[in-house]
Amino acid sequence: CKAMHVAQPAVVLASSRGIASFVCEYASPGKATEVRVTVLRQADSQVTEVCAATYMMGNELTFLDDSICTGTSSGNQVNLTIQGLRAMDTGLYICKVELMYPPPYYLGIGNGTQIYVIDPEPCPDSDF
């Protein structure tokens, strides 16, 4: 079967500092040495790319310097962290994995992780 399954948690709640982390795991049909991971956000039928990184197996993921994502990899598992989230960023975050090299190429897309972001209440001014 020429398919690659991608698993990710159904729901994640961002921290009060606007940070959300989740694991994206893929069942590789081949021995890939180069993998690309993309995080897509789906909200109101609109899809946007949040971040993407290509990495060599055994090496660290490297996102662009201005990316809101960071991550680490371990075997067929990628630990993704998205920072700077606000309530308006609540949505479905989909993990897309591509086995780039060596051939054959494989594509796998997860069902998505619903990330809920709640903006913290502003601290009331305290009287001294």
Epitope: V47, L107, I109
Partner: antibody, heavy 118, light 106 residues
Framework: QVQLVESGGGVVQPGRSLRLSCAAS????????THWVRQAPGKGLEWVAV????????YYADSVKGRFTISRDNSKNTLYLQMNSLRAEDTAVYYC???????????WGQGTMVTVSS | EIVLTQSPGTLSLSPGERATLSCRAS?????LAWYQQKPGQAPRLLIY???SRATGIPDRFSGSGSGTDFTLTISRLEPEDFAVYYC?????????FGQGTKVEIK
């Protein structure tokens, strides 16, 4: 708006070369893999080649391997297909197509006709 | 290489009728798309992921199926729907297309 525009087609003799171009606009070209697909007169669609993102990974159909070279210049938002040792069976309309976020080919160019004939 | 076989080769129907197009894969596929092509035009993406409609595609077009058997259904044919339809798998290389089904006016 989001679009792809091919150019460079024409009539060429067997054994000769031709280079096709595909100009992208309206989207971040470097964020998408881009394919060439061809269609011989009166026939179906045949995938030809793909180049990914930064250009480091390329795949080819067996029918063109060793003869065609796909490349891209992200600074110019342009995709290329260098076709060498052309054969009569390479006669077709050549389309460039974007692999969208979900992997399917969501944007296509209008096509450019290549005729290989003596 | 995954081989996609479409049936029937030609479908003769009248406007307002329902069209059912079939695509069978030589082995199980996870990612299947459907395209529409009119004479002299480029293909247009209709369905991706076997059942998700692409942006701007009318809801009379629907896709279903999994594994090796897939179906494109046009619930009520409009005059502009008479065209050739192709299925494609895109989950692994090489990318392949079916040979196409022509939907013509009866």
């Amino acid at each position: 708006q989001v679009q792809l525009v091919e150019s460079g087609g024409g009539v060429v003799q067997p054994g000769r070369s031709l280079r096709l171009s595909c100009a992208a606009s309206g989207f971040t070209f470097s964020s998408y893999g881009t394919h060439w697909v061809r269609q011989a007169p009166g026939k179906g669609l045949e995938w030809v080649a793909v180049i990914w993102y930064d250009g480091s990974n390329k795949y080819y159909a067996d029918s063109v391997k060793g003869r065609f070279t796909i490349s891209r210049d992200n600074s110019k938002n342009t995709l290329y297909l260098q076709m060498n040792s052309l054969r009569a069976e390479d006669t077709a309309v050549y389309y460039c197509a974007r692999a969208g976020n979900w992997g399917a080919f969501d944007i296509w160019g209008q096509g450019t006709m290549v005729t290989v004939s003596s | 290489e995954i081989v996609l076989t479409q049936s029937p080769g030609t479908l003769s129907l009248s406007p307002g009728e329902r069209a059912t197009l079939s695509c069978r894969a030589s082995q199980s596929v996870s990612y299947l798309a459907w395209y529409q092509q009119k004479p002299g035009q480029a293909p247009r993406l209709l369905i991706y992921g076997a059942s998700s409609r692409a942006t701007g595609i009318p809801d009379r077009f629907s896709g279903s199926g999994s594994g090796t058997d897939f179906t494109l259904t046009i619930s009520r044919l409009e005059p502009e729907d008479f065209a050739v339809y192709y299925c494609q798998h895109y989950g692994s290389s090489p990318w392949t297309f079916g040979q196409g089904t022509k939907v013509e006016i009866k």
